[in-house]
Amino acid sequence: DVERTTCPPEKEVHEIDESLIFYKKRELEACVDAALLAAQMDRVDAIPFTYEQLDVLKHKLDELYPQGYPESVIRHLGHLFLKMSPEDIRKWNVTSLETLKALLKVSKGHEMSAQVATLIDRVVVGRGQLDKDTVDTLTAFCPGCLCSLSPERLSSVPPSVIGAVRPQDLDTCGPRQLDVLYPKARLAFQNMSGSEYFVKIRPFLGGAPTEDVKALSQQNVSMDLATFMKLRREAVLPLTVAEVQKLLGPHVEGLKVEEQHSPVRDWILKQRQDDLDTLGLGLQGGIPNGYLILDLSVREALS
């Protein structure tokens, strides 16, 4: 913490300007009025403060706004944003996309994924939902940031906005996030024709249930291996060899390359070896001929 001193009369600060770069930390603390700093935040980013000096300015703002900064200050933080922790950002209420854009630009090239994720979260809370303008801003200024949101936040995306999401925006999404986004995508794209539908839904298929994957296998979509590998393990396991063959079309040969990786490995273990042999790929590990398969997932037989 910066120690308290009184400000020498000749160092009194009446406006935020470049002369402040010559102030020592102690002098900044003593001489800069927090309210003045807040009122003239738009000037701060143009002044080449050291990181140590920025620490002092942040400290001043923290004292003035212990419950969190107002958006008028947040909008003009500039490089001072780099000093913010997720805990600081959690106190904010942000509704302006201009504020979001400004801070996303500042964070570029810095290791600030936690801060950015928290900032986006605050924007979604502040705006009430993840609307089209917010999604457009994220995809333009922070590709991949959509996936930094929790499933709970993503649940506020209206299906009508899903069309604005690009495949690359979903690259870092995990299964729980895709579980939320996939049904919205299925609703949003349901009026499209088969081939157009598949192109649109493909990036979201990591959240699809078995029945949807089975239905796709009837539509000659020729799913690529990369998409197949992103399908939920639980969605792939019930598929028959014939269904997987129809689903992948000419890409079925890729199963050999992925033989040791989930979900292909787990799927192979559930198939009859005779059925796997019909693919002519040399896949090994299936259930030997003559063995009885008990499906214990159908619990009524046991209860």
Epitope: L187, F189, Q190, I201, P209, K214, E234
Partner: antibody, heavy 122, light 107 residues
Framework: QVQLQESGPGLVKPSETLSLTCTVS????????WSWVRQPPGKGLEWIGY???????NSNPSLKSRVIISVDTSKNQFSLKLSSVTAADTAVYYC????????????????WGRGTLVTVSS | EIVMTQSPATLSVSPGERATLSCRAS??????LAWYQQKPGQAPRLLIY???TRATGIPARFSGSGSGTEFTLTISSLQSEDFAVYYC?????????FGQGTRLEIK
């Protein structure tokens, strides 16, 4: 074939929480989306919300603040909790399976439980 | 939310005759509409989806038509087991919404 069975108390006091469970038998809960739909006596149907086996949910905005839908894949069950109930929540509550086929890409219901009447009264 | 309005509230038709039930949406739902039949004390049963596609096991006398905001369910030759309440449901957007129902009774 797959069957659905609702269970839970038939009488709930006002301001308390209504709790129902739907048991899926004859198939895995993993393959579809599962919904709750209710029907007040002599009235039409109202969709409450759905759940996916992973726990992902979506519910009717008119009920969202009071609704919790959860799933227990180990028991092949999903549940509904509706808090702060009033007499207006008296209804037959159905659990239903959403068709979930991309070929028809729809959010409609091809399989229903028999329904269970829940009365809200002191 | 999309409001579904069914008409008439009650329709009286003689067995063997044709019944025509209507459903109107407050905004376009494209062809994302389903029809259900419900008999007293029973759960609804899916009849039609995609506005015009019959569900598995549904007799050919049931047919659906329409797109956008106006939809029709037609039962070409009424059988005794067809007298019930019929509901339409849109799935073009959440929340999923149902019509208030049309009661089809014997004349």
């Amino acid at each position: 074939q797959v069957q659905l069975q609702e269970s839970g108390p038939g009488l709930v006091k006002p301001s308390e929480t209504l709790s129902l469970t739907c048991t899926v038998s004859g198939g895995s809960i993993n393959n579809y989306y599962w919904s709750w739909v209710r029907q007040p006596p002599g009235k039409g149907l109202e969709w409450i919300g759905y759940i996916f086996y992973s726990g992902s949910t979506n519910s009717n905005p008119s009920l969202k603040s009071r609704v919790i839908i959860s799933v227990d894949t180990s028991k092949n069950q999903f549940s509904l909790k509706l808090s702060s109930v009033t007499a207006a929540d008296t209804a037959v509550y159905y659990c239903a399976r959403e068709v979930g086929r991309i070929a028809v890409a729809g959010w409609f219901f091809d399989l229903w439980g028999r329904g269970t009447l829940v009365t809200v009264s002191s | 939310e999309i409001v579904m309005t069914q008409s008439p509230a009650t329709l009286s038709v003689s067995p063997g005759e044709r019944a025509t039930l209507s459903c109107r949406a407050s905004q376009s739902v494209n062809a994302n509409l389903a029809w259900y039949q419900q008999k007293p004390g029973q759960a609804p049963r899916l009849l039609i989806y995609g506005a015009s596609t019959r569900a598995t096991g549904i007799p050919a006398r049931f047919s659906g038509s329409g797109s956008g905001t106006e939809f029709t369910l037609t039962i070409s030759s009424l059988q005794s087991e067809d007298f019930a309440v019929y509901y339409c449901q849109q799935y073009n957007n959440w929340p999923l919404t149902f019509g208030q129902g049309t009661r089809l009774e014997i004349k």
